[in-house]
Amino acid sequence: SIPWNLERITPARYRADEYQPPKGGSLVEVYLLDTSIQSDHREIEGRVMVTDFESVPEEDGTRFHRQASKCDSHGTHLAGVVSGRDAGVAKGAGLRSLRVLNCQGKGTVSGTLIGLEFIRKSQLVQPVGPLVVLLPLAGGYSRVFNAACQRLARAGVVLVTAAGNFRDDACLYSPASAPEVITVGATNAQDQPVTLGTLGTNFGRCVDLFAPGEDIIGASSDCSTCFVSRSGTSQAAAHVAGIAAMMLSAEPELTLAELRQRLIHFSAKDVINEAWFPEDQRVLTPNLVAALPPSTHRAGWQLFCRTVWSAHSGPTRMATAVARCAQDEELLSCSSFSRSGKRRGERIEAQGGKRVCRAHNAFGGEGVYAIARCCLLPQVNCSVHTAPPAGASMGTRVHCHQQGHVLTGCSSHWEVEDLGTHKPPVLRPRGQPNQCVGHREASIHASCCHAPGLECKVKEHGIPAPQEQVIVACEDGWTLTGCSPLPGTSHVLGAYAVDNTCVVRSRDVSTTGSTSKEAVAAVAICCRSRHLVQASQELQ
Amino acid sequence: QEDEDGDYEELVLALRSEEDGLADAPEHGATATFHRCAKDPWRLPGTYVVVLKEETHRSQSERTARRLQAQAARRGYLTKILHVFHHLLPGFLVKMSGDLLELALKLPHVDYIEEDSSVFAQ
């Protein structure tokens, strides 16, 4: 009678063999910044160290009575979810607790910052193995909170946080909005986003993935062997902190970028009922539910990629949106999306020595998103090859001409306000995989990369009749690095990658009066690294 | 997950030191910004995190904090330095009147100041 949440994050291979996941996480220290905790609860006794750190505001109300079991309830439950003997995810992980929330579950940004600094200082004084910091709390967007999280992440610490329980865009909250933090939304046993009273889990592009967060069994501070069921994005974040501890115990040298990519890779895909989210947030919200890897094997041989959406550009004519990859990731392609279809494309630019993806709004447009495809590829070296608008009927073309460089993505950008008034190009002739083709009025940008053993292929799926959505997926063993539409006509809203599938969206053609000549194709670039495959075979 | 999300109030004050002479003035044309939580009930006015520029030397945090206290005292304001940050961000946490924000934003090395706000268990 395993609790539903532990079953959900356990891969089918474990369940089929009636295999208990290893008591993993033993090489990892998890810091919990929360309420006080009942450290002698049997679930966590002996595996929790209560630090002397405490930075909490006074409780509200003159008649507030501090009751130990109430003061400890939130933190005790989460400690149990992370590493509880019976109902924990990472049963071997050690825990250190810092009290930053008072008996009413309230704290301050400043108190939490001092807590994060305490962790950094501890790390400098006595460096240990991998560290995971669990922040099961949320406040309004805070520049300083996000900056502190960024610094701690860059010092090699994995930060995991709750997306928030406000049924709102997680980007409006901190630390959920910090790019370096792994932000976790909550789902229930039916894979529905969790409803909490009139509110529920936060969503949007600042959420990295979801995890079980409703009716989660965990240690109760009511007694030393009591359990209680609680719900919230804190519980979801605790699951991911536990999974992270397991992964880091198996591969202690994993970087934050590698860990995040693995969390995404091993998640259950497309199981969440997206109808729960506001319509404009569905495309931005990852449809991923966290799970443990099928075994503690090293997954280093895979080419991992993820999709990063920018903030919305806003509607002004010259507005742009920028999507960035994490520090150790490489931007392999760049695309854009606009709900109105009014956009002027996208391109890869250098910014502070790193490649970024910039999308451009068009006159009369409601704004655009830039979409970066961010990948982990050792010893990669990329450059962008650009062709100016050709003006010729065949359209603009550009290819990767450097020796050993392969095409990982195509972007197009145009200055004209509406490509729809210009004749679209014919489809790219086949047999030229290292080539990007676009509208004759657009400049075309090819992302060309070199890495040991990197090979890529172009996969196209065209539909002769107008369609709201065209998709093309990469086969097993191949990873989607690039996704773009062909041709770049006005009714194309944009292209983006969802897991290993390239999605090209068009306007509802029945309302635009478009003719069937305006067919659309999705072009996927699928890559793999023979070098990584060989390395993994040598490991085994 | 970006640092440039909307719904976040930002008050930019152009800096020009008048009373305190050039020693207190920042580099020409520099601006420090003030931030506070967009969700009003969560604001905690009276406590501020003063964040210094990234390249600021460790010792500068204490020095800037003392400087703020001295200048505030000259104006008849009491301030209390609650914490000095060294290991994550250069800066300090100060309890002071909001009247002193303009003064604090004019201090050398200041990148931005953020009003404290509440966080909640989720």
Partner: antibody, heavy 118, light 108 residues
């Protein structure tokens, strides 16, 4: 050797009260919680409450709040159960039991029979 | 409030046979469940703690298993002195201590 010895049972009039004692020996008295459990004739076990001799903290089954009071005298290594407003249904064998680290009852007294009858 | 349901209420077996008693909790209790033996006219005696650990001095023929909500007490080969009433017990918040209704193991 750990020992718990109850005393104070007997015949009580309905509406009356009585005080049971539990004398502990053979271990550090203040380290272990002591619980009172009763068993009506031919019935199962029913928990009344507990005391932490270290700090005197008590906890009761809601059913017995206001009816039972648990106390201790550390100088005598003795626990007490005061029962008020006794009725016929309070007739039972009353046991004191030591809670090992608060989770299982590793040592029990021999029990003392309380009969409530007119 | 957690309810512990023991089954069967009575078990009629002969010496040397295997006895299996189950205890089902109405809520998740992890592995924090204890088993006691009570003979007529005596106080209960702790047999198994934390679902599967034998208490001091308990013979190896007694074993416990299970976690979560379903637990089993097994006596591999009944001895004459094993005929008694067996209770399961957990800690909860209100009331803090809960006992099962008991299972009587009698001689067939």
């Amino acid at each position: 050797e750990v020992q718990l010895l109850e005393s104070g049972g007997g015949l009580v009039q309905p509406g009356g009260s009585l005080r049971l004692s539990c004398k502990a020996s053979g271990y550090t008295f203040s380290r272990y919680g002591i619980n009172w459990v009763r068993q009506a004739p031919g019935k199962g076990l029913e928990w009344i409450g507990r005391i932490d001799p270290g700090n005197g903290g008590t906890r009761y089954n809601e059913k017995f709040k206001g009816k039972a009071t648990i106390s201790r005298d550390n100088s005598k290594n003795t626990l007490y159960l005061q029962m008020n407003s006794l009725r016929a249904e309070d007739t039972a064998v009353y046991y004191c039991a030591r809670a090992n680290d608060g989770y299982s009852f590793d040592y029990w007294g021999q029990g003392t029979l309380v009969t409530v009858s007119s | 409030e957690i309810v512990l349901t023991q089954s069967p209420a009575t078990l009629s077996l002969s010496p040397g046979e295997r006895a299996t008693i189950t205890c089902r909790a109405s809520q998740y209790v992890g592995s924090y469940l204890n088993w006691y033996q009570q003979k007529p006219g005596q106080a209960p005696r702790l047999l198994i703690y934390d679902a599967s650990n034998r208490a001091t001095g308990i013979p190896a023929r007694f074993s416990g298993s299970g976690s979560g909500t379903d637990f089993t007490l097994t006596i591999s080969s009944l001895e004459p002195e094993d005929f008694a009433v067996y209770y399961c017990q957990v800690w909860d918040s209100s009331p803090p201590v809960v006992f099962g209704g008991g299972t009587k193991v009698e001689i067939k």
